[in-house]
Each structure stands twice: as C-alpha cells, then as structure tokens.
C-alpha cells in the first residue's frame, strides 16, 4: 500500500509569548513545529515515529495564521507519506518550538525550547474530507485539520490496491475508486485484455483480436462464422459440418455434380414430349406424333408418316394431307384397288395372290421390299433402333448402329465403363463419373489414381462408424467413408432407411 497522511496547520495562538517552562521569549516566540506520526497507542510514549515525522521552518512569531503553500520551504499541508497498508488508526504528536536560530532549518539549531505539544490518538479512514480540530492549553491554542489519502495509483479503504489505467495489449481499462478495473468499451476479462467480438459471432467457430470483429476458424464462413464451408468442388450440395457435401435432391456423386433428375432441372424435351431420366445427365424424349429429333424439336410434315398406300403420292395441306393415287387405286389413302392379279400389280418380283374371288389381290414381297405392291425398299433404320444417340446406317440387307464415344453394342445400348481399364492403382475403387473415372483409395494411398503412397494415414484412427469402409486419396489429408446399407453421414454415423448413393467425404 501507499498513501499520505496530510496535516494542515491553520492558526497558532500564543498571546503572551510564553514557553512551556513559564519563561517568555525575547523578543517573541519564533515558532516552528515538529510532527511525529506513529501507530496507535492508548498511552502515547516516546520512541520512533513509526509512520513518519516532519519539521517545519519558522512559521511565525507568537500568534499567527498559517497559509497554504504547495511547494518549497514551509509547505502546508504537511505531507507524511507511508508505504504500507493504512491500518485505520494512528497516534499524532504536534510540538510547537521556539528557536533563536535559523528560520529555514530551526530543528538543527541549539537552544530550541518547547512551547507546547498536543497528542491525538484515534481512528481515521482514508478519504478526501479534512477532519478539523482545535487544541487548547493554558497558554496556547492550535487549529488544524488532517486526512489520509492514497498515493497516485493506489486505491481502496487502506490504499492497498495498486491500479494503473492502461490501454495496450495487456489491458484496456480505467480504475474504479475501490481499485477494481473498469473495462473500456469493447473489452472484457479480469484484466480487460479480451476483446468483445461482433455480436452473434459464433463462440466456437469464430474469434476476434479486436472489438466488433469476427474471424472465422478453418471450415467456417459468414459474417458470424456460423456457416460451414462445404467440400471443395461441392456443386449441388450443402454441409452441416465443414468439408461435407450432402447432395441436394436430384443430385449425386462425391461432389453432387451428377444430375439425377435432368428432366426436372432442365426440361430438355420440347413440343409436349415425355422426358424420362436415365441415370446421371441421361434422359430420353418420347415424341408426340408429328415431331422428331433428340429433343422432339423438329416438326414432321403431315406426310412424314407415309399415309398414302399403294404408291400414292402425298401432298401437305394446311392441317392435313392429300393422297394422289396411281391408276387402279382410290380412297383417302389409296387403300382401295381396282386392279387384279391380271394387271401384274406386284413389283420387284413380288408374287400376286387373288382375293375376294378375284376382285382384289395381295402381294407377297421378296426380302428387302415392302408396300402393298412391293414398291418400297425396306429402310431398316426407320424404327430408330440405335440407342444413346447412335447413328443408324443401312448396309445392304442389314443395318448397323454407329455409336457415340462411350457406348457399344448392336444398338449402342451398352455404356463403356472408364473403369474397364482398371485405372486405379493399389486396389483403389473406380467410380464412373461424367468427367471421367474417380478413384477412392485404400488406406495409405492418395492421388488421382491412388498412385501416391502417403505417410500420414487418415484412416489409421478408424474414423468410420457402423462397419463402413475407409478410403483416402480424394484429396490430401482427407478420408472417405463408404457407408453400408442403412447409414449416412461423413463418418456413416447416422442411421437412415435408404442407402447413400455415393460415399460421403469427411
């Protein structure tokens, strides 16, 4: 602790100019004071001034008023500093002396004589208010006041609490009257060294180094660091914990970039045709009559369905068509014949068979020919036999399908797997994705093709639950849990009714 006992001398009266021994001063009592402050004693005794002592220069002769003086010789109030916890009690001895000698340092002069003394014992609390008193004896009167105040930076009832206001990285505070810290705005903690982050900043996922700031820890984002960052490359997915990629409805794949519902998302089929999903980014359009093309985007002519029979020629009209029949035929579609076998109506070596007692006929066509009169060469591509966008080509009596890259089979109905050539090393599992094969690697390997042996095995700690298989290698330091039926989650920790369509990335 540290404080100051202050004594303010106000007035001393010694009208007769007498000493304590009854003698008078000549020409007058040139008066100075000795003050002794010590611990409380019920009976004041001689001995060391344990709390301090001080002397004044000559302040006046016989009777005088003592003026306040802030510095130099004759300072008033008198200061008695102490460097301990103020006990709240004290004993004070004030002696008035006459000196025949030096005005400034009278206590060193020989021949000094006591005029009078007073003794005060009691309790005194620390505070700014002066306690005023007056002491009389038969010859003299002394008016004075006193108090105890704490030294700069000391606080509390006994001046025992040290507090120095500061505004640096070891504290941002001012000092309360009791010495406790009062944090400056934006700061908290015992020493006011902890910044108060932006209101709402997530306690675990965010932090700050200065007030009203919110810095996100790895894996989190947003103004309040309450939004997780999904796995890098996650396209149509979300996360509930960082680096997750939980696919939105209709999307699949490790990065949720496989469109499982292309029909709904893109509506590729035009002109009222029916769209059917057929795997990632796959779909087929079933056209309404009168339309064709991969997306049913091409309108057919009314004659496109070859409605005219027996070699009739078709003419498009505004909302319909008209058949011009060859000789011997009539009807809307030239379906009625006036010919008989006698007219040799069958072309291309077709055999004529009479019907209805010779009033009509039917042609039996040789291979590769068709039509009522065998007049049409068979087009084996008419039925669109080639799947997955394959091109149909007539080859004499047969036809072949020319397949798009990635498909094979007589009708291009088979998908050629990128995984067929086993691109994954070290027992990695291959997944056919839109942009090529992706390998999920066994423990201890990573890289696009599981070709890199890694020293840190992310699977070593057994992070996958419920019997899931752990793979590494999707990206450095990552692992993948391939969940068994009935479990999902980055570590296959959540039971559900349906199996996940792809492994989850942790």
């Amino acid at each position: 602790g540290s404080g100051i006992f202050q004594l303010r001398l106000q007035e001393f009266v010694n009208q007769r100019g007498m000493l304590a021994n009854g003698q008078s001063c000549e020409p007058g009592c040139r008066t100075f004071f000795r003050i002794c402050l010590k611990h409380f004693q019920a009976t004041f005794s001689e001995g060391p001034c344990t709390f301090g002592n001080v002397s004044t220069p000559v302040l006046g002769t016989n009777s005088f008023v003592v003026r306040d003086k802030n510095s130099g010789s004759g300072r008033n109030p008198l200061q008695l500093p102490f460097n301990f916890t103020w006990p709240g009690t004290f004993s004070l001895n004030i002696q008035a002396w006459h000196t025949p000698g030096d005005d400034l340092r009278p206590e060193t002069s020989p021949g000094n004589s006591l005029i009078s003394q007073i003794i005060i014992q009691g309790s005194l609390a620390v505070g700014k208010i002066w306690r005023t008193d007056e002491q009389n004896d038969t010859l003299t009167r002394l008016s004075y006041s006193y108090r105890v105040i704490c030294s700069d930076n000391y606080y509390g009832e006994s001046c025992s609490r040290l507090c120095k206001k500061r505004d640096d990285h070891f504290g941002h505070y001012e000092c309360q009257p009791d010495g406790s810290l009062s944090c400056l705005p934006g700061w908290t903690g015992k020493y006011c060294d902890q910044p108060i982050c932006l209101s709402g900043c997530h306690e675990q996922n965010g932090y700050c180094s200065k007030p009203d700031e919110c810095i996100c820890r790895p894996g989190w984002q947003g103004r309040l660091c309450n939004e997780c960052i999904p796995h890098n490359g996650c396209r149509h997915g979300t996360c509930s914990i960082p680096w997750q990629c939980a696919c939105d409805e209709g999307w699949g794949g490790l990065f949720c970039d496989q469109d499982l519902n292309y029909c709904t998302h893109h509506s590729p089929c035009k002109n009222g045709s029916t769209c059917s999903n057929s795997g990632p980014k796959g779909y087929t359009c079933t056209c309404l009559p009168g339309y064709t093309g991969e997306h049913c985007e091409l309108g057919l002519s009314k004659c496109a369905s070859n409605p005219c029979r027996n070699g009739g020629s078709c003419k498009d009209q505004e909302n319909s068509y008209h058949c011009l029949c060859p000789p011997g035929y009539y009807g809307q579609h030239c379906e009625h014949s006036t010919l008989t076998c006698a007219d040799s109506p069958c072309f291309n070596g077709g055999s004529c068979r009479e019907r209805n007692q010779g009033s009509s006929y039917a042609c039996e066509c040789p291979p590769n020919f068709t039509g009522s009169n065998c007049e049409k060469k068979v087009d084996r591509c008419t039925s669109n036999p080639c799947a997955n966008g394959g091109q149909c080509q007539n080859r004499g009596p047969s036809r072949t399908c020319r397949c798009r890259p990635g498909f094979t089979g007589t009708h291009c109905e088979l998908h050629i797997s990128d995984c067929a050539r086993s691109p994954c090393a070290h027992g990695g599992t291959c997944h056919d994705l839109e942009n090529g094969p992706v390998c999920t690697c066994p423990a201890g390997f990573s890289g696009r093709r599981c070709e890199v042996r890694i020293t840190h095995d992310a699977c070593a700690s057994g992070p996958c639950f419920n019997g899931a298989t752990c793979y590494t290698g999707l990206s450095p330091n990552n692992f993948v849990c391939n969940c068994p039926y009935g479990f999902v989650g980055s570590r296959c920790e959540f039971p559900v009714g349906l199996p996940p369509s792809f492994p989850w990335v942790a």
């Epitope: 120095k164 500061r166 990285h169 070891f170 903690g189 020493y191 060294d193 180094s209």
Partner: antibody, heavy 121, light 106 residues
C-alpha cells in the same frame, strides 16, 4: 513447467532475411492471457524488445523495427516465429523468445536460452 | 520514443543495500518490471508490477515506483547477486527496456 526453445540458422548474409522459430513445451500457446515475444541483445549491449504475438495472431512491433519484422504463430505446432528482413551487421545479436503474462502486467516470466545470430558475408 | 535511464554501474559491499534507479517520464503511472541477467544466461524476472516478487525470488529483492523513478533495492546483498539488472515498462503497445545496470559486489 513451461519451456521455450529458439531454433534457426546461426549465420545470415547481409540483405537476407533472418528466420527463427520458438517452440513452446509444457503449456499451450493457445492459452489466453499470454503474449509471445522476441527480444534481442547485441554482444556486450542491453536488451531490445522486438515484438510479440498472441494465439489469435494479434501482433505488436517495436516501431524502430516495424518495417522489417514479421511475427507469426502456428498453434497446431505450438510454435511462433520471427522474420527480420534486409539484415545488416547491426542485427547481430543473441535472440531470445519469451512469454509475457497479462497477470504479471506484461512481465516475462519464461525465457528461452537464446540463440546467437551472426550477420556476415 | 520512450526511454528508460539507468546508472551504468552500482557497487556494494556484501551485506549492504544496493539501490538501482530507473527513470522515465511519468514512469510511476506505468508498471515496472526488473530482470536479473548473469553472464551467458537468459534474463530472470525478479520484480513485476512495481514491487511484487515472483515465486523463488529471495525477499531481499524489493521494488518501488512513483513519480518518474522506479527503484530496485537489494537488501543484504550477496556475492551471487552480482549481475546486470534491467528495468522494463510498456509504453502503449511497445516494450521498453532500460540500458542496464551492472551491480558489482565488492
């Protein structure tokens, strides 16, 4: 008990960058209430405070060195580092790392043993 | 920039009291720390918060700080106290060391 250990090259060429790392053991660098500081002492001379950092990455530098100093922290490794660029012979000194304690009003209660860095071609 | 001034050297006889001063503008309004450094060793904190001793520091080390001066006092100085002593304070966010005082025990 907390221990600090400086590491880095003992010889650096003029105009190059001095790089030192302080590894903390026996306590977490992520604890609040501490700053982690660098102090240097040229041969036969007094101590000079270089700068400090806390776990959140808040840095404070001596204004006389600020343009050349970078202090960083790696909480995962329980380390903090000093980089001093464009060094000259005047940067030859024993470099200490130390823990500064808020409770001790910024006093440094734990110090590394120091590492001498000489700047010479 | 803020400066702390110390006497270069102080000599004391064994058993006597050594006082080392550290002066700086309004230093009494800042917290002063004192460090002891023996040749070839790292500094050791002997006083913090003007007058407090860390555990393990002998009672003969004491400190005070008011006005413009902080003082480290070694009562009953022993030969093992011979060392360099540095005062330190914080000026806003910058650590400042005194120039150091070499204490010689005669």
């Amino acid at each position: 008990e907390v221990q600090l250990q400086e590491s880095g090259p003992g010889l650096v060429k003029p105009s190059e960058t001095l790089s030192l790392t302080c590894t903390v053991s026996g306590g977490s660098i992520s604890s609040s209430g501490y700053y982690w500081g660098w102090i240097r002492q040229p041969p036969g001379k007094g101590l000079e405070w270089i700068g400090d950092i806390n776990y959140a990455g808040s840095t404070y530098y001596n204004p006389s060195l600020k343009s050349r100093v970078t202090i960083s922290v790696d909480t995962s490794k329980n380390q903090f580092s000093l980089k001093l660029s464009s060094v000259t012979a005047a940067d030859t000194a024993v470099y200490y790392c130390a823990r500064e304690d808020v409770i001790l009003r910024g006093g440094s209660d734990y110090w590394g043993q120091g590492t001498l860095v000489t700047v010479s071609s | 920039s803020y400066e702390l001034t110390q006497p270069p050297s102080v000599s004391v006889s064994p058993g006597q009291t050594a006082s080392i001063t550290c002066s700086g503008q309004r230093l009494g309004d800042k917290y002063a720390s004192w460090y002891q450094q023996k040749p070839g060793q790292s500094p050791v904190l002997v006083i913090y918060e003007d007058s407090k001793r860390p555990s393990g520091i002998p009672e003969r080390f004491s400190g005070s700080n008011s006005g413009d001066t902080a003082t480290l006092t070694i009562s009953g100085t022993q030969p093992m106290d011979e060392a360099d002593y540095y005062c330190q304070a914080w000026d806003r966010d910058t650590g400042v060391f005194g120039y150091g005082t070499k204490v010689t025990v005669l």
